[in-house]
């Protein structure tokens, strides 16, 4: 659950985030699991720890292995594992499956290919894009921030897309590449204003103090592939990750599902070891897409333990 796969190519930069998160003020220690040897924090090292991030600048095949991160606060320690694999660069153009990030789909009207993991790096535009190793040229291709937009998508646009950028660390530049497949869906879909299925508006969810609780934000957005659709949680009207309560975590990915042919997204909020103060918070489920934003709210109430008499 708190283990994450990461991969990279030799002689490229690789930055890995600890799967366990906490306040920025919490210290994070990194270890190489096989030897239990501490990873240094001094930036002069090729491999060093920088808070929640583990940096390989650049990576070497020998760096492969499992790394342990321990988030330390005054009251608790939390452990996560990063399973890192560094591969040799391929001489030919084919990108093997094990180097591929998740596949994305596009349609004639909407096509966005995000550059995977780029948010972890200190990069500056322009981002370079390649399809099957060929640099993309022409007015149909637009590199915008961390994604590529393809105008008037055709079935021939399907393929493997690689983004290439430069990570800067203290004046030194390191190359990074990441590849994902793009598929083209030829379907007559449509998009609707988000419809939130869960939680119900003003829902009150019963929880037990000391136990774990899950809240699901679920919304549907139309039929077929949806673009710029998202569901997310807010805590007291602010971003979950910045609220500063590591017991309350939003799942990393959004689960896509289909309900009566409609495209829906779910986002789970996990509350570990529910405390009294959690009952005072407001949990907002936000669903948004090109049409607009909609919000539902849920509060927690204490579940009264039922006496079981024989």
């Amino acid at each position: 659950k708190f283990s994450k796969q990461s991969w990279g190519l030799e002689n490229e930069a690789l930055i890995v985030r600890c799967p366990r998160q906490g306040k920025p003020s919490y210290t994070v220690d990194w270890y190489y699991s096989q030897t239990n040897k501490s990873i240094p924090t001094q930036e002069r090292n090729r491999v060093f720890a920088s808070g929640q991030l583990l940096k390989f600048l650049p990576a070497a095949v020998a760096d492969s292995g499992i790394y342990t991160c321990i988030v330390r606060s005054p009251t608790f320690n939390r452990t996560g594992y990063a399973n890192v694999t560094i591969y040799k660069k391929q001489s030919d153009c084919n990108v093997p499956d094990y180097l591929m990030y998740s596949t994305v789909s596009g349609s004639e009207k909407n096509s966005k290919i995000y550059c995977p993991t780029i948010d972890l790096y200190n990069w500056t535009a322009p981002l370079e894009w390649f399809k099957n190793c060929q640099a993309l040229q022409g007015s149909r291709y637009r590199a915008h921030k961390s994604f590529l937009v393809i105008d008037n998508v055709m079935t021939e646009d399907a393929g493997d897309y690689t983004c290439k950028f430069i990570h800067n660390e203290n004046g030194a530049n390191y190359s990074v590449t990441a590849t994902r497949s793009f598929t083209v869906k030829d379907e007559q879909g449509f998009s609707l204003f988000p419809v939130i299925g869960a939680p119900a508006q003003n829902e009150i969810k019963e929880v037990e103090i000391g136990k774990n609780a899950n809240l699901t934000c679920s919304a549907c957005f139309g039929k077929g592939t949806q673009f710029l659709a998202a569901v997310l949680w807010q805590l007291n009207g602010t971003k979950i990750t910045d609220f500063g309560e590591p017991r309350i975590q939003q799942e990393e990915g959004q689960n896509q599902s289909f309900s009566n042919g409609l495209a829906c997204l779910d986002m789970v909020l996990r509350i570990a070891d529910v405390k009294e103060e959690d009952l005072l918070l407001q949990y907002d489920c936000l669903a948004l897409n090109l049409h607009g934003l909609r919000r539902h709210t849920v509060r927690l109430s204490r579940k009264n333990p039922i006496d079981h008499h024989s």
Partner: antibody, heavy 116, light 107 residues
Framework: EVQLLESGGGLVQPGGSLRLSCAAS????????MHWVRQAPGKGLEWVAV????????YYADSVKGRFTISRDNSKNTLYLQMNSLRAEDTAVYYC?????????WGQGTLVTVSS | DIQMTQSPSSLSASVGDRVTITCRAS??????LAWYQQKPGKAPKLLIH???KLQTGVPSRFSGSGSGTDFTLTISSLQPEDFATYYC?????????FGPGTKVDIK
């Protein structure tokens, strides 16, 4: 203390452009959605636009869609409103505001006058 | 889009009076409703959020009620500093919309 300070207002001719800025301080700017709201002289409040924490999601009132662009620079704790193709009916005091499921803090506003 | 209506559009009252302002949404908005007070030349000030919750620092004579489509702002005993214009706003769904306002002035 939460502070929002708008600037960039002034007199502009119809069809012209103006860029408003809002400097935020006293809170974690990048953790909040942010709004622009306007008020024409002697009239009520009109919501203009909202932007998500990282700027990836933006929504507009129909009256400004296609003409106004909301943006933000989290490294500078600043919110922007780029206003193009301005019309006389855009004359108003423009407020920048913080979202917490409602608007809980407002700036003092900056006056935009569109007139020939 | 969700339309917000307020009534009355204006009212005259005396210090000590109980004042009630209503706000109606054209469709259900749950409790995503806020009330603001605005005085001439000033920015609006948040009074009530989530339909019923008093914003920190706001006097307890202000209260909010309702959910769904019908909402009420009540001032239990009007004070001289309460003469102002009051707006409701829904934040359930974009475009977020304000009511046209209710002006409370001295009788």
């Amino acid at each position: 203390e939460v502070q929002l300070l708008e600037s960039g207002g002034g007199l502009v001719q119809p069809g012209g452009s103006l860029r408003l800025s809002c400097a935020a301080s006293g809170f974690a700017f990048s953790s909040h959605w942010m709004h622009w709201v306007r008020q024409a002289p002697g009239k009520g409040l009109e919501w203009v636009a909202v932007i998500s924490y990282d700027g990836s999601n933006k929504y507009y009132a129909d009256s400004v869609k296609g003409r106004f662009t909301i943006s933000r620079d989290n490294s500078k704790n600043t919110l922007y409103l780029q206003m193009n193709s301005l019309r006389a009916e855009d004359t108003a005091v423009y407020y920048c505001a913080r979202d917490r499921g409602m608007i809980d803090y407002w700036g003092q506003g900056t006056l935009v006058t569109v007139s020939s | 889009d969700i339309q917000m209506t307020q009534s009355p559009s204006s009212l005259s009252a005396s210090v000590g009076d109980r004042v009630t302002i209503t706000c109606r949404a054209s469709q259900g908005i749950g409790s995503w409703l806020a009330w603001y007070q605005q005085k001439p030349g000033k920015a609006p000030k948040l009074l009530i959020h989530a339909a019923t919750k008093l914003q920190t620092g706001v006097p307890s004579r202000f209260s909010g009620s309702g959910s769904g489509t019908d909402f009420t702002l009540t001032i239990s005993s009007l004070q001289p500093e309460d003469f102002a214009t009051y707006y409701c706003q829904q934040s359930y769904s974009t475009p977020f919309t304000f009511g046209p306002g209710t002006k409370v002035d001295i009788k």
